[in-house]
């Protein structure tokens, strides 16, 4: 039975040409994180796999950056970069859970952080 | 040419270890991941594991975790794999393939011949 | 893990006619899929990679298609040495990079 919840950043925001951080943090279960996928909408960025470690897609490897921790750092922000991001832990036994980030991309200097939420 | 060339056939008995070679050639080594899958008489394909070639970091399949070591000499080019305690049931054709880069992943370009392992009493 | 699928598992089909092989993913891989063909008493050989682009020295009667779960290969038009076992496969989540039970092309 998959006991975990996926805690995320929430909504974000951030300006154009600047960069943010995309965290997401599993808790209450025991299960073994095997990988995490980073994807934005059905595209992969990044991975970081428990036994090899961080893995840059080469499409974004010059504007992504691995952590903190199992987060993943977006630079050189662009409108472009608003939509949906999804963090996607692999565990074991449990199997997978998912969280889901928003990121909008300003134009103004005016960027507010969402408040944290938690994804059951 | 690209090319993996393994060891030869091998019989064993239960319970005991056989170590599998496969040498590569026609590419830089270490920059390519390296995986072992194999394929039990006239069943699928099955994968054990994977090595990173540059720095020696594995990441094995849950059912062979305990049994299975996979090794690296970058002198000669060439990666290991070793299963132990081994049983009827692991008569198979053991082959490497080079996967991706190191860097990314990818799927399994280039194979070696296979190396056939009998595990009989 | 995710579990890959393939149907059917046996395809009966003439030469010259087209042959189209499916696989289904668990959950999404993407488009990180590939194909592979075997034949008997030989290693399997790369066809497909990114669900859609042809290995080196692949022809191009050979084409895949598909993004997430659901994902096709289909060989326009039959030739004799293409009648083997083919094999779909995800590499995005490991351990284990898992295989599909395979498809055997057989002559009708």
């Known amino acids: 039975m998959m006991t975990g919840t996926i805690e995320t950043t929430g909504n974000i925001s951030a300006e154009k040409g600047g960069s943010i951080i995309l965290q997401c943090h599993l808790s209450s279960t025991t299960a073994q994180v095997t990988q995490v996928n980073w994807e934005q909408q059905d595209q992969l960025l990044a991975i970081c796999n428990a036994d090899l470690g961080w893995h840059i897609s080469p499409s974004f490897k010059d504007r992504v950056a691995p952590g903190p921790g199992l987060g993943l750092t977006l630079q050189s922000l662009t409108v472009n970069d608003t939509g949906e991001y999804f963090c996607i832990y692999h565990t074991y036994p449990d199997g997978t859970y998912t969280g889901r980030i928003f990121l909008e991309v300003l134009e103004s200097s005016v960027a507010e952080h969402g408040a944290r939420f938690q994804i059951p | 040419q690209v090319q993996l060339v393994q060891s030869g056939a091998e019989v064993k008995k239960p319970g005991a270890s056989v170590k599998v070679s496969c040498k590569a050639s026609?590419?830089?080594?270490?920059?390519?991941?390296m995986h072992w899958v194999r394929q039990a008489p006239g069943q699928g394909l099955e994968w054990m594991g994977i090595?990173?070639?540059?720095?020696?970091?594995?990441s094995y399949a849950r059912k062979f975790q305990g049994r299975v070591t996979m090794t690296r000499d970058t002198s000669t080019s060439t990666v290991y794999m070793e299963l132990s305690s081994l049983r009827s049931e692991d008569t198979a054709v053991y082959y490497c393939?080079?996967?991706?880069?190191?860097?990314?992943?990818?799927?399994?370009?280039?194979w070696g011949q296979g190396t056939m392992v009998t595990v009989s009493s | 893990e995710i579990v890959m699928t393939q149907s059917p598992a046996t395809l009966s089909v003439s030469p010259g006619e087209r042959a189209t092989l499916s696989c289904r993913a668990s959950?999404?891989?993407?488009?990180?899929l590939a194909w592979y063909q075997q034949k008997p008493g030989q290693a399997p050989r790369l066809l497909i990679y990114?669900?859609?682009t042809r290995a080196t020295g692949i022809p191009a009667r050979f084409s895949g298609s598909g993004s997430g779960t659901e994902f096709t290969l289909t060989i326009s038009s039959l030739q004799s040495e293409d009648f083997a076992v083919y094999y779909c496969?995800?590499?995005?989540?490991?351990?284990?990079?898992?295989f599909g039970g395979g498809t055997k092309v057989e002559i009708k």
């Open positions: 026609g590419y830089t080594f270490r920059e390519y991941y």
């Open positions: 090595i990173n070639p540059s720095i020696g970091l594995t």
């Open positions: 990114g669900a859609s």
């Open positions: 959950q999404s891989v993407s488009s990180n």
């Open positions: 393939a080079r996967g991706g880069r190191t860097t990314w992943i990818g799927a399994l370009d280039i």
């Open positions: 496969q995800q590499y995005v989540v490991w351990p284990p990079l898992t």
